[in-house]
């Protein structure tokens, strides 16, 4: 999954007016206001790895 421009969720974030771009293995963490290493998920039934989508029952990828 390629890098994407993010909508910063918190107006309290230091860089709230500037969208943050993270590389492929990272995502934006509003807690630390920076890109951090980000793990992917897989669905237990299919084993497919994907970005975590709201409302889906996913488990963290084992051993990552």
């Amino acid at each position: 999954m390629g890098a994407r421009r993010l909508r910063v969720r918190s107006q309290r974030s230091r860089d709230s007016s500037v969208p943050t771009q993270c590389n492929q293995t990272e995502c934006f963490d509003p807690l630390v206001r920076n890109c951090v290493s980000c793990e992917l998920f897989h669905t237990p039934d299919t084993g497919h790895t994907s970005s975590l989508e709201p409302g889906t029952a996913l488990q963290p990828q084992e051993g990552s």
């Epitope: 920076n34 951090v36 998920f41 975590l52």
Partner: antibody, heavy 125, light 107 residues
Framework: EVQLVESGGGLVQPGGSLRLSCAAS????????IHWVRQAPGKGLEWVAW????????DYADSVKGRFTISADTSKNTAYLQMNSLRAEDTAVYYC??????????????????WGQGTLVTVSS | DIQMTQSPSSLSASVGDRVTITCRAS??????VAWYQQKPGKAPKLLIF???FLYSGVPSRFSGSGSGTDFTLTISSLQPEDFATYYC?????????FGQGTKVEIK
């Protein structure tokens, strides 16, 4: 296997100093934020500080600001909490923890997934 | 700072009971809430993150819900090993604050 091991706790007099260490294995601390959380005897969890080693960002609880300093040495894969001007109310078990992030549409969805065993700091005369 | 108000502070329940713990944030925090379980003398364990996602290895009897300011942790059928203290924590903005905890005791 991911593991965090704290050390450096002990008995110290009010006004004294201690440095806690959090040695990480099984992952590189530069890729995550590392947090210190404390728990006074019989009380709840209180977040103390975090460091993002990759860029050196830090933040502190108001109760320790100006007295405690969090840092990290990525070459040693270890985080530290330097505690100065210690007070009786700093008496607690101190845990270090890793914040894990999972990708939710490019934004971190996460929590503190690995914790150390804790180290007891007692401030008393 | 965002305050996390947890209720109840303690509850008594029996094995097999359905238990619900709530956490209210003083400001809107989207779904940036995690839930932890802690047993005496042990470090906390992550149960739920992003309000509703079950952490790896956590039994499916645990579930989380909510967004905005109101969040819930539910244990669908309490087991003997579930008697512990539970904490919510927000991570929408620093400092990441914990609720005061809910102690689940045996009735």
């Amino acid at each position: 296997e991911v593991q965090l091991v704290e050390s450096g706790g002990g008995l110290v007099q009010p006004g004294g100093s201690l440095r806690l260490s959090c040695a990480a294995s099984g992952f590189t601390i530069s890729s995550s934020s590392i947090h210190w959380v404390r728990q006074a005897p019989g009380k709840g969890l209180e977040w103390v500080a975090w460091v993002l080693p990759s860029v050196g960002f830090t933040d502190y609880a108001d109760s320790v600001k100006g007295r405690f300093t969090i840092s990290a040495d990525t070459s040693k894969n270890t985080a530290y909490l330097q505690m100065n001007s210690l007070r009786a109310e700093d008496t607690a078990v101190y845990y270090c923890a890793r914040r894990v992030c999972y990708n939710r549409l490019g934004v971190c969805a996460g929590g503190m997934d690995y914790w150390g065993q804790g180290t007891l700091v007692t401030v008393s005369s | 700072d965002i305050q996390m108000t947890q209720s109840p502070s303690s509850l008594s329940a029996s094995v097999g009971d359905r238990v619900t713990i709530t956490c209210r944030a003083s400001e809107e925090i989207a779904t940036a809430v995690a839930w932890y379980q802690q047993k005496p003398g042990k470090a906390p364990k992550l149960l739920i993150f992003a309000a509703s996602f079950l952490y790896s290895g956590v039994p499916s009897r645990f579930s989380g819900s909510g967004s905005g300011t109101d969040f819930t942790l539910t244990i669908s059928s309490l087991q003997p090993e579930d008697f512990a203290t539970y904490y919510c924590q927000q991570s929408e903005v620093s400092p990441p604050t914990f609720g005061q905890g809910t102690k689940v005791e045996i009735k």
